[in-house]
């Protein structure tokens, strides 16, 4: 879901899910503004004190980032300005399952978005011909 | 293809007032910030203004702020310029330009002359 | 305001050459620095974003790198279309700025 309005920003998340041992992606979009300084990404998990990853003035900021996740986030830093807040989570692992907060804060206001994000050992059917 | 297709410059007195249009095509024109950008004769390249995807940030050069405005129709998958108060040193090729991580997608561009 | 100072203004070079332009920011601008190439009467066409990460379609030799306030774009090897002006420019943030521009001359 999304918040928007008054002061605030429209964030989009999309539930989705990772493969045990696997990179992931949780999918996050916001309108993006037209410079890069004014932007802040925080990805937090439910249950969790400190930070999934946090992303503000151009680069991480990994200083509050919690111990779980040490070097296994990042953002597609490249794509920030054009409004995808998405994470890159390395490696994931069971305990990665839950529900994260894309919140976003730009000059125009912020606004935030949950999503859940399923982990197990998923995968492609194998289709004999 | 992507293209930007500027039109509207042309030849106008100081104090006169332009606008310019720019036609997008070939992408989803609502999805993209977009910018206007000028070069003078012989000059380089100045920023003139932007607008964001849905227009919820705008912004705009000192030397225009005030007299010109930047407005999207994204209906139409148009962007424009509305010049007023038009002064000699506006003179210049306008492009329009995609935001991007960058500008990855310019238009040829449409002159303005502001002379009396 | 952030100024984007390119170096040098003009260049003369053969093809072949390796070339250099540099671009020095003010102040901090991450790596939100883009690269273009203008050839006269033409729009300019986007080469490298996000510092060093070249655009679809642009040729190999050409490569930017640089974070923070320093900056630079090099061509490995001039090829003979390669001869143009060359721009940097900041979207960190507004107003946005560009480098006022190297011209890359045949010697």
């Known amino acids: 879901f999304g918040i928007s309005g008054k002061h605030f920003i429209t964030v989009t998340t999309f539930t989705s899910a990772g493969n045990i041992g696997e990179d992931g992606t949780l999918s996050c979009t916001f309108e993006p503004d037209i410079k890069l300084n004014g932007i802040v990404i925080q990805w937090l998990k439910e249950g969790i004190k400190g930070l999934v990853h946090e992303f503000k003035e151009g680069k991480d900021d990994l200083s509050q980032q919690h111990e779980m996740f040490r070097g296994r986030t990042a953002v597609f830093a490249d794509q920030v300005v054009v409004g995808n807040a998405s994470l890159r989570l390395k490696n994931v692992q069971l305990t990665d399952a839950g529900t994260y907060t894309c919140y976003i804060r730009t000059s125009k206001g912020k606004g935030n978005a949950n999503l859940e994000y399923k982990t197990g050992a998923f995968s492609m059917p194998e289709i004999n011909v | 293809e992507v293209q930007l297709l500027e039109s509207g410059g042309g030849l106008v007195q100081p104090g006169g007032s332009l606008r310019l249009s720019c036609a997008a095509s070939g992408f989803t024109f609502s999805s993209y910030g977009m910018h206007w950008v000028r070069q003078a004769p012989g000059k380089g390249l100045e920023w003139v203004a932007s607008?964001?995807?849905?227009?919820?940030?705008?912004y705009y050069a000192d030397s225009v702020k005030g007299r010109f405005t930047i407005s999207r129709d994204n209906s139409k998958n148009t962007l424009y310029l509305q010049m007023n108060s038009l002064r000699a040193e506006d003179t210049a090729v306008y492009y329009c330009?995609?935001?991007?991580?960058?500008?990855?997608?310019w238009g040829q561009g449409t002159t303005v002359t502001v002379s009396s | 305001d952030i100024q984007m100072t390119q170096s040098p203004s003009s260049l003369s070079a053969s093809v072949g050459d390796r070339v250099t332009i540099t671009c020095r920011a003010s102040q901090s601008v991450s790596s939100a620095v883009a690269w273009y190439q203008q050839k006269p009467g033409k729009a300019p066409k986007l080469l490298i974003y996000a510092a060093s990460i070249r655009e679809s379609g642009v040729p190999s030799r050409f490569s930017g790198s640089g974070s923070g306030t320093d900056f630079t774009l090099t061509i490995s090897s001039l090829q003979p279309e390669d001869f143009a002006t060359y721009y940097c420019?900041?979207?960190?943030?507004?107003?946005?700025?560009f480098g006022q521009g190297t011209k890359l001359e045949i010697k």
């Open positions: 330009a995609r935001a991007s991580s960058g500008m990855d997608v």
């Open positions: 420019q900041q979207y960190y943030s507004t107003p946005l700025t």
């Open positions: 607008i964001s995807s849905s227009s919820g940030y705008i």
